[in-house]
């Protein structure tokens, strides 16, 4: 988790002088509770946005937006702590909005936004906005949390982000798999424009089962520059097992930008359709 590196982060708006600061996720008001604390945020919304760095790289970011409740506690609101927690790694990153002037009620509801937390493709997050100061130990909570899911690199907008392109999202191998005689599969795919090796992983399954009955790995050496964007054809020999008829072919590239963590592409060959048992043809014709 990190913050997007472009521009000075701003939270000021007409009628409010505000600065964005890094935070340890442990606000001082936890340690030194205050008697009077503001109410919780209202209508917290988290959306996926995209933003460029100063270097021109495009990253997915969490766009966080919330409003203030229209009660008197606005007079005691000193700022907000924004926290993003990556669920599986338990990694947390926080920033603090520090209000340098007192908030006053005005003709429309106060609204705040922040779009600088960089998020990873295909990951899950919890976003929390805490109003400051935080409540006394037994006080009513004054935060709001929402979970947030980032699409993977198959998603149209995600595909062109820097982290997705680094893991090979622009490579479309257009895999075709053809069943040949004598228990063989012909796999064909388009090579990318990099001199890197590939691996074909074949997993076979019985019809309607999810436990594999055959696995095979085939190594494809790095192509020469004149072979870039050309089709590579490989013939794989299957184990002659009755009913082991559904085949999943997965191609794993080893591009320099993602090494052994590149996006894999796969194709599946289903078991052949079993024809309905035909009616037996009688060997004589009745005469009625």
């Amino acid at each position: 988790l990190r913050l997007l590196d472009h521009r000075a982060l701003v939270c000021s708006q007409p009628g409010l002088n505000c600065t964005v600061k890094n935070s340890t996720c442990l606000d001082d008001s936890w340690i030194h509770p205050r008697n009077l604390t503001p109410s919780s945020p209202k209508d917290l919304q988290i959306q996926l946005h995209f933003a460029h760095t100063q270097q021109g790289d495009l990253f997915p970011v969490a766009h966080i937006e919330w409003t203030l409740q229209t009660d008197a506690s606005i007079l005691y609101l000193e700022g907000a702590e924004l926290s993003v927690l990556q669920l599986n790694t338990n990694e947390r990153l926080c920033v603090r909005f520090e209000f340098l002037s007192k908030l006053r009620h005005h003709h429309r509801r106060w609204r705040f936004t922040f779009s600088h937390f960089v998020v990873d493709p295909d990951q899950e997050y919890e976003v929390t906005v805490h109003h400051l100061p935080k409540p006394i130990p037994d006080g009513d909570p004054n935060h709001q949390s929402k979970n947030f899911l980032v699409p993977d690199c198959e998603h149209a907008r995600m595909k062109v982000t820097t982290p997705c392109m680094s893991s090979g999202s622009l490579w479309d191998p257009n895999i075709t798999v053809e069943t040949l005689e004598a228990h063989q599969l012909r796999v064909s795919f388009t090579l990318w424009n990099e001199s890197t090796h590939y691996q074909i992983l074949l997993t076979s399954f019985p019809h309607m089962e999810n436990h594999s009955c055959f696995e095979h790995m085939h190594h494809i050496p790095a192509p020469r520059p004149e072979e870039f964007h050309q089709r590579s054809n490989v013939t794989l020999t299957l184990r002659n097992l009755k009913g082991c008829c559904r085949h999943q072919v997965q191609i794993q590239p080893f591009f320099s930008s993602c090494l052994n963590d590149c996006l894999r592409h796969s194709a599946t060959v289903s078991c052949p359709e079993m024809p309905d048992t035909p009616e037996p043809i009688p060997d004589y014709m009745p005469l009625w």
């Epitope: 209508d43 669920l87 599986n88 790694t89 338990n90 899950e124 929402k146 979970n147 899911l149």
Partner: antibody
Framework: QVQLVQSGAEVKKPGASVKVSCKAS????????ISWVRQAPGQGLEWMGW????????NYAKKFKGRVTMTTDTSTSTAYMELRSLRSDDTAVYYC?????????WGQGTLVTVSS | DIQMTQSPSSLSASVGDRVTITCRAS??????LNWYQQKPGKAPKLLIY???NRESGVPSRFSGSGSGTDFTLTISSLQPEDFATYYC?????????FGQGTKVEIK
Amino acid sequence: QVQLVQSGAEVKKPGASVKVSCKASGYAWTRYGISWVRQAPGQGLEWMGWISTYSGNTNYAKKFKGRVTMTTDTSTSTAYMELRSLRSDDTAVYYCARRVLRLDYWGQGTLVTVSS
Amino acid sequence: DIQMTQSPSSLSASVGDRVTITCRASQDIDSSLNWYQQKPGKAPKLLIYAASNRESGVPSRFSGSGSGTDFTLTISSLQPEDFATYYCQQWANMPGTFGQGTKVEIK
């Protein structure tokens, strides 16, 4: 091919404990959390909690807090769910699933029967 | 906890029919909703995530829509393999609660 393979059916007496395992393959184990969901016979799905495969951090549904423990073994890419002080209404199929918010791959389920 | 209410609890339909299942949340959950399909004796299968995104490999006849508190799963042309029970699940806040399920039966 992503696969989650669970341990076999169990029959337990009331008051006993059960430990269900869930072995994952076909993806980077520490990239996604593991959730546990149960389903009583003829009933709907009930979320029990999840565990981070990266940090071991857990998040349990209130109903199961104090009675459930979720753990992982990174060396074998296996998650475990232990439920203690079993009651007859814990009779259910227990599923593990990959991820926390979007449960995209599921184990085949483990039937736990609690009967005296 | 957020309550999820599905309707109808069961329905009868024929192959080729257009089927609509609705799910209502007890509070605003944005688009934080998934749909699952479960066949007897099998584990649930993810169909739609984040209200409207079809999971990889799911046929295009399945679609999801809605935001806030009201959501819909639509099967545009029911196929024989679609007869199953369907569950919605919210993940805006933990615990991730499920609807009670909608059983789609053959008419």
